[in-house]
């Protein structure tokens, strides 16, 4: 018995489309072998019409496709513009047509509903507007105009020129009589529903001399576009509903059971909690089109999504919509990266950001997700030497460790740094990851003085105390600038006395600046790392002033100045929007990324006890 399964019978009508799903055991061999759809001949052969290797028969050219979904163990054959000639017996299968790994499918295409003579066919998408034109003769110019819908055997009045409107059409229909020159009236129906489809009759006059015109209204439900994205990757839904709804609230919803469509995000400010920190609704264009980016795709994000327009900001009957069926591929090319990183006030975090290793020369960015309105992500730093003014001295983007990962270090943490951050590049838009920074109770591990003042021409020594937990780490001092942090020579001064209950493995490592110049003014960081993986950092601002009295300065923890006030948010922020970054690809085809793995290591980053994987930026 063949393990392939599918629909035994498919019935449709001319002009329609069908999507035939065939199920197979998702073994490694099956997932990668050829998939086919063939038509059985009278003599028993089976002629391939379409296969997963790219073959498409001339009979199917331009109207069929075959899509494999390997992790689900399914493939789908879509056939459009059906005709009665398509009726017959088919097989969907794996491997070679004659080899029995197949399932028999009977497709029956019947003739569409017959139309009366002189019937005008209107084919309109769900939620859109149709205008049914009804000509009449001069003798009926002053007589009653009406539109009827054929329900079974009986015509039911929909609207007439005396002001009647059928309750099913209230608020969305009007009858327009053209100027005296034109012998035409028209009925405009908005927010079309599936139930509006059918045969209509428009009439001018009520007697035997009345003018009649038949109309057939076909309301098309949008076929969902199949979207196939990687776990931890991102998806962008581009929604173009037309200028007629440019000023109507927009939404993206996800169909749950039955008829419900739960709002994911809308332009009225609603956002589903499951998408907090990983969704942006891109501003609409003048034509009413917009896009929604969802990053950090999860298995449970799979499903049918609808975008639409309605004043309520949610799906209602008559909303114009677009539809997508999202599949999330669990065999992802995107590596796991931490989704939660924890740090303490005054401490630091080091965030590892994955990117497509084929695009090592791409520009790297880090931005802060903001939930206000429809969500936005103002840039904080990039790999080209730009740092937002508010973050000078405490934020650095490093190309290390390279080969598909870059590092972002943020220190001098405050409670205001808690939130969601996105790692992204101007290259492959799939590779966008989201990380949440949480500020937890605790003390920074590294101890440095507060602000330090150096004297021109003199020597300055700045201490950094490392607890014993970092005994196996490389310790360093560096001078921060907006392109990174340039390493400086430092001296190991032996065990530190700054820690209680810490043995000889604690360390005091000093930075010495000889013959201080004005150029030495700025931010200095001490930190720990293992190879190219960075751990905790601490920052000190060194100010330079004129000589007052001779000698060198040796700064201790006790003499530390208070930390400087936080700098004010600069008004010239850059954010991830079409207009904000020179490279249009950043939001032209947005996609993104993220998954589990909290950052490890005490105050710099502690792990939830339930976390199965930890990132130790400082403990690799």
């Amino acid at each position: 018995k063949s393990p392939i399964f599918g629909p035994e019978e498919v019935n449709s009508v001319e002009g329609n489309s069908v999507s035939i799903t065939c199920y197979y055991p998702p073994t490694s061999v099956n997932r990668h072998t050829r998939k086919y759809w063939c038509r059985q001949g009278a003599r028993g052969g089976c002629i391939t019409l379409i296969s997963s290797e790219g073959y498409v028969s001339s009979k199917y050219a331009g109207r069929a496709n075959l899509t494999n979904f390997p992790e689900n163990g399914t493939f789908v054959v879509n056939i459009a513009q059906l005709s009665q000639d398509d009726s017959g017996r088919y097989k969907c299968g794996l491997g070679i047509n004659s080899r029995g790994l197949s399932f028999d499918v009977s497709l029956e295409v019947s003739q569409g509903p017959g139309l009366l003579n002189d019937t005008k066919v209107y084919t309109v998408d769900l939620g859109r507007t149709v205008t049914i034109n009804c000509p009449f003769k001069t003798e009926n110019a002053q007589k009653r105009k009406s539109l009827y819908k054929q329900i079974g055997l009986y015509p039911v009045l929909v609207i007439d020129s005396s002001g009647y409107v059928n309750p099913n059409y209230t608020g969305r229909i009007r009858l327009d009589i053209q100027g005296t020159g034109q012998l035409l009236f028209s009925v405009v129906i908005n927010q079309l529903r599936l139930s509006d489809a059918g045969q209509y009759l428009c009439q001018a006059g009520d007697d035997s001399n009345s003018n009649k015109k038949n109309a057939d209204l076909q309301v098309l439900k949008p076929e969902p576009e199949l979207v196939y994205e990687d776990l931890r990757g991102s998806v962008t839904f581009h929604c173009a509903l037309g200028p007629e709804v440019a000023n109507v609230a927009k939404f993206l919803c996800r169909q749950s059971s039955g008829e419900n469509c739960d709002v994911v995000v809308n332009t009225l400010g609603k956002r589903a909690p499951a998408f907090e920190g990983r969704i942006l609704l891109n501003p609409q264009d003048k034509d009413g089109s917009f896009s929604v980016v969802i990053t950090g795709l999860r298995k449970e994000d799979a499903g049918r999504y609808l975008c639409g327009a309605h004043s309520d900001g949610q799906l209602q009957e008559g909303s114009p919509i677009q539809a997508w069926q999202l599949f999330v591929n669990e065999e992802s090319t995107i590596p796991r990266s931490p989704t939660v990183v924890k740090g303490v006030a005054g401490g630091s975090v080091a965030v590892l950001c994955p990117y497509n290793r084929k695009e090592s020369k791409s520009i790297k960015y880090w931005c802060l997700w903001e939930g206000a309105q429809n969500g936005r992500c103002p840039l904080l730093v990039d790999s080209e030497g730009w740092v937002k003014a508010q973050y000078e001295g405490r934020l650095s983007l490093l190309e290390e460790p390279g080969n598909g990962t870059f590092t972002v270090i943020l220190n001098q943490l405050t409670s205001r740094d808690a939130g969601f951050y996105w790692c992204l590049t101007n290259g492959d838009t799939l590779w966008r990851t989201t990380v949440e920074i949480k500020i937890i109770e605790g003390e920074p591990n590294l101890k440095v003085p507060g602000n330090v003042t150096a004297v021109l021409g003199e020597t300055l020594k700045v201490p950094c105390h490392f607890p014993c937990k970092f005994s196996s780490y490389e310790k360093y001092w560096c001078k921060w600038n907006n392109t990174g942090c340039q390493a400086l020579p430092s001296q190991d001064e032996g065990p530190s006395k700054a820690f209680v209950n810490c043995d000889e493995n604690s360390r005091l490592v000093s930075l010495t600046l000889n013959l201080v110049t004005r150029a030495d003014e700025g931010w200095y960081w001490c930190g720990v790392k293992q190879g190219h993986f960075y751990g905790e950092t601490a920052a000190v601002y060194v100010a330079v002033e004129e000589r007052k009295a001779a000698g060198s300065r040796d700064v201790s923890l006790a003499k530390a100045d208070a930390a400087p006030d936080e700098k004010v948010l600069d008004s010239g922020f850059r954010e991830i929007e079409n207009k904000a970054i020179q490279d249009p690809r950043l939001f032209a085809e947005e996609k993104a990324v993220a998954d589990t793995r909290d950052q490890a290591d005490g105050s710099r980053a502690s792990v939830d006890s339930g976390s199965s994987e930890e990132q130790g930026g400082s403990s690799r």
């Epitope: 035994e8 019935n11 489309s17 039955g258």
Partner: nanobody
Framework: EVQLVESGGGLVQAGGSLRLSCEDS????????MGWFRQAPGKERDFVAA???????????YYSDSAKGRFTASRDNAKNTAYLQMNGLKPEDTAVYYC???????????????????WGQGIQVTVSS
Amino acid sequence: EVQLVESGGGLVQAGGSLRLSCEDSGRTFGDYIMGWFRQAPGKERDFVAAISWTGDSTYYKYYSDSAKGRFTASRDNAKNTAYLQMNGLKPEDTAVYYCAARTFRIDYDPRTASTYNYWGQGIQVTVSS
């Protein structure tokens, strides 16, 4: 909320026929699938047949090996009702029959009971020899 109500079960002689009906309410949007499952005493709930449909007069019918050629799934959209016509009934068809429904998704196998959101209360079919 979708509610499913089965009817048409009962006692029948081997070789006889029954038509089960399953009326559903509450569905207004999206492609849909209605499955028929059966559970004999002390056994698992097994797939029998399913019918899925779109709003454009297109139907897809699925059958288990044991139902193939004997049972026919159908649907009357006007009545919001699905049917399972069972011919050539055998004693081994004796079971409680359930109808189940959900939005159609191509990554959900119609044969997998756990993918269905809504279930009827079940109806007894007994085939005597």
